[in-house]
């Protein structure tokens, strides 16, 4: 929609456009209207841009007025909210960007007889993109000067110069995208495919045999298991075989049968011969033992004479019986073959709680801190440790001792400092707990023991040029007197900033005011008018960039009137043969200085920033981790102080390191028993615990220990067409386009003749960010006007 | 206030259509994404088909998939769904449901409109 | 496609009970569940949606809780116009899916 709003009327004399009164009566002595004001409403009128305004025709943007809303004079400037200065012209069209405005002051009659008379009126011939931003406009000419400020916005979920690009965020099973500030889907976490309602599956899966419907999921084929679905399903009941595809069971080596369930190689599998014994295989699962002298048995287990190899372990001595042998034990062993420790903790003789260690026809007690010997019985002196660490004297106890603390000191060990800090501190100033004392850190503003005291900042008179001073919480503020600025008043009010004058004037700055030395073709207190110059009499070709035309406000009684063939980024330039050249604005280049330069060509953006091309400037998207007009600074990113419990944090890039103390874990040391919690990998990564350290396995698209850095994959090689710069978004990307085009990837040319700018039945040919109109018979001039 | 109200039910043979359609009222139409949910009688309900707000993306349950077509005309603020090749299984009040465009749930319904399919 | 099963089926109460109602998912739907009533000859009504969020209009006995797989609505004092059949649904992705109903009867 357009908006407009009116800002002051001053009409000094209450009088009409026609010089009559708005009351009607003149005084006779001095021939000022009588005190019956005017009763102010405004027309507007918004049509197609028109480089010779018409005041007829179709407003065929729209138009509108607003109800009465002052007398002679008034200033709404500070009325914010209030709509009746308002009006708001909606349109269903793309928004051309250029356009031309009428607005009439007008003086209504309060009586249906009389008619209303127009009081000023004013146009305005320009380009607006839509913006938030209000653009002041004023009439300073004629019997009433009024100011107003306009602006063009883009309805809810519209963008784009021309507000005809629609995206509304959402989240449901049709799309999970929020819009950015040019109106492109951006895919919320999980999500992808042009309307981001393709799930992104799990890191790994295999896009052959698995797939999903919601993020992080993967779901097998019939044939395929595990958890990325790369692994096949075997034949049921295959034992000891695998598979390359579904169903199959090759056998694994020494391994048979259609199940590979029989063993080719039963001696080498379960060495069944004991006693040196030599084992054969004489089929699938079967064997045979050829055993040594001295032994035999289907497995050479039959010792013929027992004692030969030495059954009896630990220093145990063997002797042969009529069932083979028998030993008999040293101390601290027992079992058929000594090989059983004697438990002799059983039971136990540890006092206290001590806890008992078995040795070898021994026991060892293990004593808890306060008592020793043999049997923990004996009370231990805790004081030999020096455990009291801020005490006067450790006194030992039966199984305990007490420390004498010094003053301000506490605790069992006297470690901790007695918090002095008790609300003493004032105005929100922080306190330091010391040793038996504190100490108030004071806020800025404050000073004392206890930050009780208000610095006043006006001590040194600080304003300047009889500026006074005004005594702040910890700062002052300068008020001025007329014709001084700044926070000391230090400087002298420059009417000139930012600059009033358009179209390119010098401004001039006054005592109280400003002066704008217009162009040749611009006339009006800001150099907002363009001047008519076919109000008189024809013209006459000089060159081709120029026309003279009669005047009577020039000495010599002609004005030259100068070519607009170079657009609005260029002058013309006469050449000879009737021909002419283009010198371009600062940034613009080409025959008519229609392109935009590219500024980025120097590749100024640092660290994987991506330059997005300006008029005369550009701008660095950076890449995560990096910021500043280049690009340039690391961001601190252990600003926050992410580490926990003591650990020390290391600043990379777009992420940081946690180096942890005594024994916590994870990335932000904030655990005692994993490295990995929901929050350790970022974008869909999944985190694997090392035990010491994690581990992150990035979806495509992201990189870095953490999964913290987009991969420039996604803009290699460049998906943007026609000159647009490519954005990394995680495993998307967004272009940027040149001005002409449009489209996720750039490839639409704008549709420039829309809407339909060529007149009395002119053809409009659409070219790359630019369009020309083929007259029709009778017709010329740009438009066919 | 909101208002559906669904329209062109009745009784018609298995192999035959129908077509129903779904007046809406009280809110902006053309920003949210409409649906048609069906209840056989005794049973639970059953999600049938959904169309987003400019009619670009349509969604439908296997069950119905290449029988039933569902459509919109945003500038009478109507919904449609085509039905073909109608079947016994297909009985069932039919109910007609707006979805605001966060979470997808049906905040409003219709009242619903009957559909029998028998010889 | 996400299967939705509720527990348990039907439920006697009486007026002043608290009643919860459970619904699974078959896979994890984040917080998309929604929650609604219906009274017999009627077209349903939204309670719940997103899990937790009360739709306008709704009194504030009624609650959901869970997120991924599990999750439960709760009526914290049974009111007699409460007694109705009560269905979850998913809406994370298509096809949309509903548990095959709770029925809340009067004991």
């Known amino acids: 929609q357009f908006e407009l709003e009116i800002l002051s009327m001053q009409n000094v004399n209450g009088e009409l456009q026609n010089g009559n009164c708005c009351g009607g009566a003149r005084n006779p002595g001095d021939r000022k209207c009588t005190r019956d004001e005017c009763d102010t409403y405004f027309k507007v009128c918004l049509k197609e841009y028109q480089s010779r305004v018409t005041a007829g025709g179709p407003c065929s943007f729209g138009s509108g007025s607003t109800p009465v809303i002052g007398g002679n004079t008034f200033n709404l400037k500070a009325s914010r909210g209030n709509d009746r200065n308002r009006i708001v012209l909606p349109f269903s069209f793309a928004w051309p960007r250029s356009y031309t405005l009428l607005v009439e002051a007008w003086d209504s009659s309060n009586d249906t007889v009389q008619p209303d008379s127009i009081i000023e009126k004013a146009s305005h011939s320009g380009m607006i993109n839509p913006s938030r931003q209000w653009q002041t406009l004023k009439q300073n000419t004629g019997v009433a000067h009024f100011e107003y400020q306009i602006r063009v916005t883009c309805d809810d979920y519209y963008y784009g110069f021309g507000c005809n690009k629609f995206c509304r965020p959402r989240d449901d099973f049709f799309g999970h995208y929020a819009c950015d500030q040019n109106g492109n889907k951006t895919c919320m976490e999980g999500w992808m495919g042009p309307e981001c309602n393709r799930a992104i599956c799990r890191q790994g899966c295999s896009p052959k045999h698995g797939s999903c419907k919601l993020p992080g999921d993967c779901r097998c084929q019939y044939g395929w298991q595990g958890l990325y679905c790369d692994k096949c399903i075997p034949h049921p009941g295959c034992v000891h075989g695998i598979c390359n595809e579904p169903w199959q069971c090759l056998c694994e080596t020494n391994w048979g049968g259609q199940l590979c369930d029989k063993d080719l190689n039963y001696c080498g599998t379960h060495q069944p011969c004991l006693n040196g014994g030599t084992c054969s295989n004489t089929g699938p699962d079967k064997y045979q033992c050829s055993c040594p002298e001295g032994y035999s048995g289907p497995n050479c287990e039959i010792a013929e004479h027992a004692c030969l190899s030495d059954p009896c372990h630990n220093r145990g001595s063997c002797k042969e019986t009529s069932l083979g042998f028998e030993c008999e034990c040293s101390p601290g062993w027992t079992g058929p073959t000594c090989s059983t420790n004697i438990d002799d903790c059983s039971p136990n003789n540890c006092s206290h709680g001590g806890t008992c260690q078995d040795l070898v026809n021994g026991f060892k007690c293990v004593c808890p801190p306060q008592w020793t010997g043999k049997t923990c019985q004996l009370d231990a002196n805790e004081c030999e440790a020096k455990p009291c660490v801020n005490a006067k004297s450790c006194k030992n106890l039966i199984a305990s001792y007490y420390c004498d603390c010094l003053p301000g000191w506490m605790g069992q060990n006297c470690d901790i400092n007695i918090n002095d800090c008790l609300g003493q501190c004032q105005n929100d100033a922080s306190c330091r707990d010391l040793v038996n004392g504190y100490r108030c850190i004071c806020p800025p503003g404050y000073a004392g023991d206890h930050c009780e005291r208000d610095i006043d900042e006006c001590a040194s008179n600080p304003c300047l040029n009889g500026g006074h001073c005004q005594n702040e919480i910890n700062r002052f503020q300068c008020l001025c007197p007329t014709g001084f600025s700044g926070n000391l008043c230090q400087l002298d009010i420059d009417y000139c900033e930012p600059n009033p004058c358009q179209n390119g004037a010098q401004c001039y700055n006054r005592a109280s005011d400003y002066f704008c030395k217009c162009p040749e073709d611009y006339e009006g207190k800001n150099c907002s008018h363009l001047k008519d110059h076919c109000r008189t009499t024809p013209c006459e070709v000089i060159d081709s960039c120029t026309v003279a035309m009669a005047s009577n406000d020039t000495p010599e009684g002609v004005r030259y009137i100068s070519s607009n063939v170079c657009g609005p980024h260029g002058k013309c330039k006469s050449q000879s043969g009737g021909k002419f050249t283009c010198d371009c604005n600062k940034g613009f280049t080409g025959t008519y200085c229609h392109e935009n330069i590219n500024d980025c060509e120097s590749n100024p953006c640092r660290n994987g920033g991506t330059c997005i091309d300006g008029v005369n400037s550009y701008k660095c998207i950076c890449s995560d981790g990096w910021e500043g007009a280049y690009c340039e600074t690391n961001i601190n990113d252990c600003s926050q102080n992410p580490c926990h419990n003591g650990g020390t944090c290391r600043d990379l890039v777009n992420d940081f390191y946690c180096d942890c103390k005594n024994g916590w874990k994870g990335k932000t040391c904030h655990s005692r028993d994993s490295q990995c919690d929901e929050a350790t990998c970022n974008n869909g990564g999944t985190c694997y615990d090392e035990g010491d350290a994690f581990k992150c396995m990035c979806p495509g698209g992201w990189e870095g220990t953490t999964c913290n850095i987009a991969r420039n994959s996604s803009c290699l090689p460049n998906p943007c067409h026609n000159g647009g710069t490519c954005v990394v978004n995680g495993e998307s990307f967004t272009c940027v386009c040149k001005e002409g085009w449009e489209g996720p990837i750039c490839a639409q040319n704008t549709n420039d003749c829309s809407p339909h700018p060529c007149y009395n039945s002119g053809t409009c040919v659409d070219g790359d960010n630019w369009y020309r109109c083929e007259c029709a018979p009778g017709f010329a001039g740009p438009d066919c006007r | 206030e909101v208002q559906l109200l669904e329209s062109g039910g009745g009784l018609v043979q298995p192999g035959g259509s129908l077509r129903l359609s779904c007046a809406a009222s009280g809110f902006t139409f053309s920003s949210y994404a409409m649906s048609w949910v069906r209840q056989a009688p005794g049973k639970g309900l059953e999600w049938v088909s959904s169309?987003?707000?400019?009619?670009?993306?349509?969604y439908y349950a296997d069950s119905v998939k290449g029988r039933f077509t569902i459509s919109r005309d945003n500038s009478k603020n109507t919904l449609y769904l085509q039905m073909n090749s109608l079947r016994a299984e297909d009985t069932a009040v039919y109910y007609c449901a707006k979805s605001p465009p966060y979470y997808g749930q049906f905040d409003y319904w219709g009242q619903g409109t009957l559909v029998t399919v028998s010889s | 496609d996400i299967q939705m099963t509720q527990s348990p089926s039907s439920l006697s109460a009486s007026v002043g009970d608290r009643v919860t109602i459970t619904c699974r998912a078959s896979?994890?739907?984040?917080?998309?569940l929604n929650w609604y009533q219906q009274k017999p000859g009627k077209a349903p009504k939204l309670l719940i949606y997103?899990?937790?969020s009360l739709q306008s209009g709704v009194p504030s006995r009624f609650s959901g809780s869970g997120s991924g797989t599990d999750f439960t609505l709760t009526i914290s004092s049974l009111q007699p116009e409460d007694f109705a059949t009560y269905y979850c649904?998913?809406?994370?992705?298509?096809?949309?899916?509903f548990g095959q109903g709770t029925k809340v009867e009067i004991k």
């Open positions: 169309i987003e707000q400019m009619g670009w993306q349509t």
């Open positions: 896979q994890s739907i984040s917080s998309y």
């Open positions: 649904q998913q809406s994370v992705v298509a096809p949309l899916t």
């Open positions: 997103a899990a937790s």
